[in-house]
């Protein structure tokens, strides 16, 4: 004969647990009903009665099936060098990151609770490494040969256009000036030079070796969240 | 937090040479520069260099080219400044300071290291 | 190298005074000025960069402004820990500190 399914509440089996989306009720000594995410239980189980859930109220959540007493609260709004990436709803809670030329400093376990502006490169420096949504840009004097004169969250050191009779030297924070109309090549703007180090001045000391791995150039995109612990080990 | 540790002074004879050291902590060693400063009893402050711990790679105010070598060490976080031929003018407290390359300059210092040229 | 003449040398003033200190720079140095704090027996102590940023931590009777390039060190009521060394520090082209301002208390 088949088992008989067994509705909640029910004692169960000695040395057995209880079923998904069930927990065991301590007091009642009974496997009883979780609430579903977005409720909670109002009404905790007896011997002879189910637990009783009920929906979350405004700015309130519940992401698991749980048997919590009260749902939790939504975090703060989110302040102005965030953006709302999830709003609090009655299954999940807010979520902040940080806006765009902006930097996670200190995160939470689903979102950032302190962002930081982007460093900016000074002109004579590089990006090296660019930021993340977790880390800050790394700025590094340009290479001899190549130049920054901006002061930027994302622009590389660019070569030095070659000139055939150079007006004025370039430096680590100026292109080199051309007498000619013309340079006889200037190297694509859109070619990739980071910052091995340059000083601000034309003169250097050491040869620069190349980085044993290459910084990358584009920033990362951002990380999916991850639950927050609730009153319940999940389903 | 950040800091900046120095050796302690020194006394050398006109001719020789002194290595001062700078031992960072508290920030990643290798994404900043570290300048050299120096300033003479009751005088002014004079930037000597840098060095990019990362690559090596050094800037050298005109004055020192011929005599200065910045090195630095990434596994001990530790940047070094030697100074030679040295001479009685050379005699000065010696900085070394952090600078993350934005607008932002020089946040950092050590707390300075006394180099006393004397015969 | 670009020069950076900073004034006064020395300057006497009292508590509560409202204090100048003024830097010109041989060259345009954009707004790459920065000025240091220096008390006897120690390390200098950045107040501002980039010509009106504050470091963090600095008192807001603090301020950089520019005129040209004419840098100004404001101290809009002195305290009794201002007392100290003054210099300015242009980082665009190159590197080059100012004379110094030694401010005493009258």
């Known amino acids: 004969l088949p088992a008989q399914v067994a509705f909640t509440p029910y004692a169960p089996e000695p040395g057995s647990t209880c079923r998904l989306r069930e927990y065991y009720d301590q007091t009642a000594q009974m496997c009883c009903s979780k609430c579903s995410p977005g409720q909670h239980a109002k009404v905790f189980c007896t011997k002879t009665s189910d637990t009783v859930c009920d929906s979350c109220e405004d700015s309130t959540y519940t992401q698991l099936w749980n048997w919590v007493p009260e749902c939790l609260s939504c975090g703060s709004r989110c302040s102005s060098d965030q953006v709302e990436t999830q709003a609090c709803t009655r299954e999940q809670n807010r979520i902040c990151t940080c806006r765009p030329g902006w930097y996670c400093a200190l995160s939470k376990q689903e979102g950032c609770r302190l962002c930081a502006p982007l460093r900016k490169c000074r002109p004579g420096f590089g990006v090296a490494r660019p930021g993340t949504e977790t880390s800050d840009v790394v700025c590094k004097p340009c290479a001899p040969g190549t130049f920054s004169n901006t002061t930027s969250s994302t622009d590389i050191c660019r070569p030095h256009q070659i000139c055939n009779v150079v007006a004025i030297p370039g430096n680590a924070s100026m292109d080199a000036v051309c007498t000619s109309t013309s340079p006889t090549r200037s190297m694509a703007p859109g070619a990739v030079h980071l910052p091995q180090p340059v000083s601000t001045r034309s003169q250097h000391t050491q040869p620069t070796p190349e980085p044993s791995t290459a910084p990358s150039t584009s920033f990362l995109l951002p990380m999916g969240p991850s639950p927050p612990a609730e009153g319940s080990t999940g389903d | 937090q950040v800091q900046l540790v120095q050796s302690g002074a020194e006394v050398k004879k006109p001719g020789a040479s002194v290595k001062v050291s700078c031992k960072a902590s508290?920030?990643?060693?290798?994404?900043?520069?570290i300048h050299w400063v120096r300033q003479a009893p009751g005088q002014g402050l004079e930037w000597m260099g840098w060095i990019d711990p990362d690559y090596g790679n050094t800037d050298y105010a005109d004055k020192f080219k011929k005599r200065v070598t910045m090195t630095a060490d990434t596994s001990i976080s530790t940047a070094f400044m030697e100074l030679s031929r040295l001479r009685s003018d050379d005699t000065a407290v010696y900085y070394c300071a952090r600078d993350e390359g934005s607008p932002l300059v020089m946040d950092a210092w050590g707390q300075g290291t006394l180099v006393t040229v004397s015969s | 190298d670009i020069q950076m003449t900073q004034s006064p040398s020395s300057l006497s003033a009292s508590v509560g005074d409202r204090v100048t200190i003024t830097c010109n720079g041989s060259?345009?140095?954009?707004?790459?000025l920065a000025w240091f704090q220096q008390k006897p027996g120690k390390a200098p102590k950045l107040l501002i960069y980039?010509?009106?940023s504050l470091q963090t931590g600095v008192p807001s009777r603090f301020s950089g402004s520019r005129s040209g390039t004419d840098f100004t060190l404001t101290i809009s009521s002195l305290q009794p820990e201002d007392f100290a060394t003054y210099f300015c520090f242009q980082y665009n082209n190159g590197y080059m500190f100012g004379g110094g301002t030694k401010l005493e208390l009258k």
């Open positions: 980039s010509t009106y």
């Open positions: 508290g920030y990643t060693f290798t994404d900043y520069i």
């Open positions: 060259q345009n140095i954009d707004n790459y």
